[in-house]
């Protein structure tokens, strides 16, 4: 029977993801009972992605490794709407690594997922990025400008934001 085979497929997919995430929160997409989209519990979801705020303080490299262990990457922010969603879950007195770095110190910024960096769609604080030796990007709160990005030294431990595609089962 169709529903039975669909359930069996779902269960095998869920087993696949259990190595990363013991628990998933799933919602039915639209009216079709066949399509469920899931995020690991307790990640948050926005559009087609899941987000996790990591409160452990680590360097940029270790933060990216921490995300990848969970099947994710440091966050790539593509739109103002996405940033507006993310900041709802951040603390104003903390800074969080983004998946954005300038490894050569040439101001050729790179996103971890190879999305081409487009300065027209960036949210740097005014006057940033301002130091060739500061090669990793964070998002933080400044009272004058609200939330924005800043370049910092990559080895300085920060909190971080992980992002992964929603799991469809």
């Amino acid at each position: 029977n169709f529903m039975y085979s669909k359930t069996v497929k779902r269960l095998s997919k869920l087993r696949e993801y259990q190595q990363y995430h013991p628990s998933l929160t799933c919602v039915m997409e639209g009216k079709d009972i066949e399509d469920w989209s899931c995020c690991p519990t307790p990640w948050t979801s926005f559009q087609s992605s899941c987000y996790f705020i990591s409160t452990g303080m680590q360097s940029w490299t270790k933060s990216q490794k921490n995300c990848s262990v969970m099947g994710a990457d440091l966050v790539v922010i593509n739109t103002r709407e996405e940033q507006d969603f993310i900041i709802q879950n951040l603390k104003r007195n903390s800074s969080y690594f983004l998946g954005l770095s300038d490894p050569g110190g040439r101001r050729h910024w790179q996103w971890v997922d190879q999305t081409p960096y487009n300065e027209n769609v960036t949210f740097w604080h005014s006057g940033e990025p301002n130091n060739l030796d500061e090669r990793c990007a964070i998002i933080n709160f400044r009272s004058s400008e609200e939330w924005g990005w800043n370049d910092i030294h990559c080895h300085v431990p920060q909190k971080s934001i992980c992002k992964m595609k929603k799991i469809y089962i």
């Epitope: 040439r106 050729h108 910024w109 081409p116 960096y117 027209n120």
Partner: nanobody
Framework: QVQLQESGGGLVQPGGSLRLSCAAS????????MGWYRQAPGKQRELVAV???????NYVDSVKGRFTISRDNAKNTVYLQMNSLNPEDTADYYC??????????????WGQGTQVTVSS
């Protein structure tokens, strides 16, 4: 294919000034950072100054206070005003641009270089 054309190099006496220009042409969607690099004989190419699309500039320590980078986004052009030149500034100066050819295709473009000689 994007072309970068430098101009403004030449021979100048110590303490003198030069203004380099670099214009980008070709199929360009947008340009992120634009910068100037230099390579002295027998040395590696090094970054001199770089400027973001929004006008944030960064300089290497050896030129701070003497060189000024600027750009005209409408003309896809970057400039380098060089004051108080000294013989150590003698080098071939290369323009570089981080170009978006389309919203999802990126190219690291270089000019052919312009020679700057500081000598009395």
């Amino acid at each position: 294919q994007v072309q970068l054309q430098e101009s403004g190099g030449g021979l100048v006496q110590p303490g003198g000034s030069l203004r380099l220009s670099c214009a980008a042409s070709g199929r360009i969607f947008s340009i992120n950072a634009m910068g100037w690099y230099r390579q002295a004989p027998g040395k590696q190419r090094e970054l001199v100054a770089v400027i973001s699309r929004s006008g944030i500039s960064n300089y290497v320590d050896s030129v701070k206070g003497r060189f000024t980078i600027s750009r005209d986004n409408a003309k896809n052009t970057v400039y380098l005003q060089m004051n108080s030149l000294n013989p150590e500034d003698t080098a071939d100066y290369y323009c570089n641009a981080d170009v978006l050819l389309t919203f999802n295709k990126r190219e690291d473009s270089w000019g052919q270089g312009t020679q700057v000689t500081v000598s009395s």
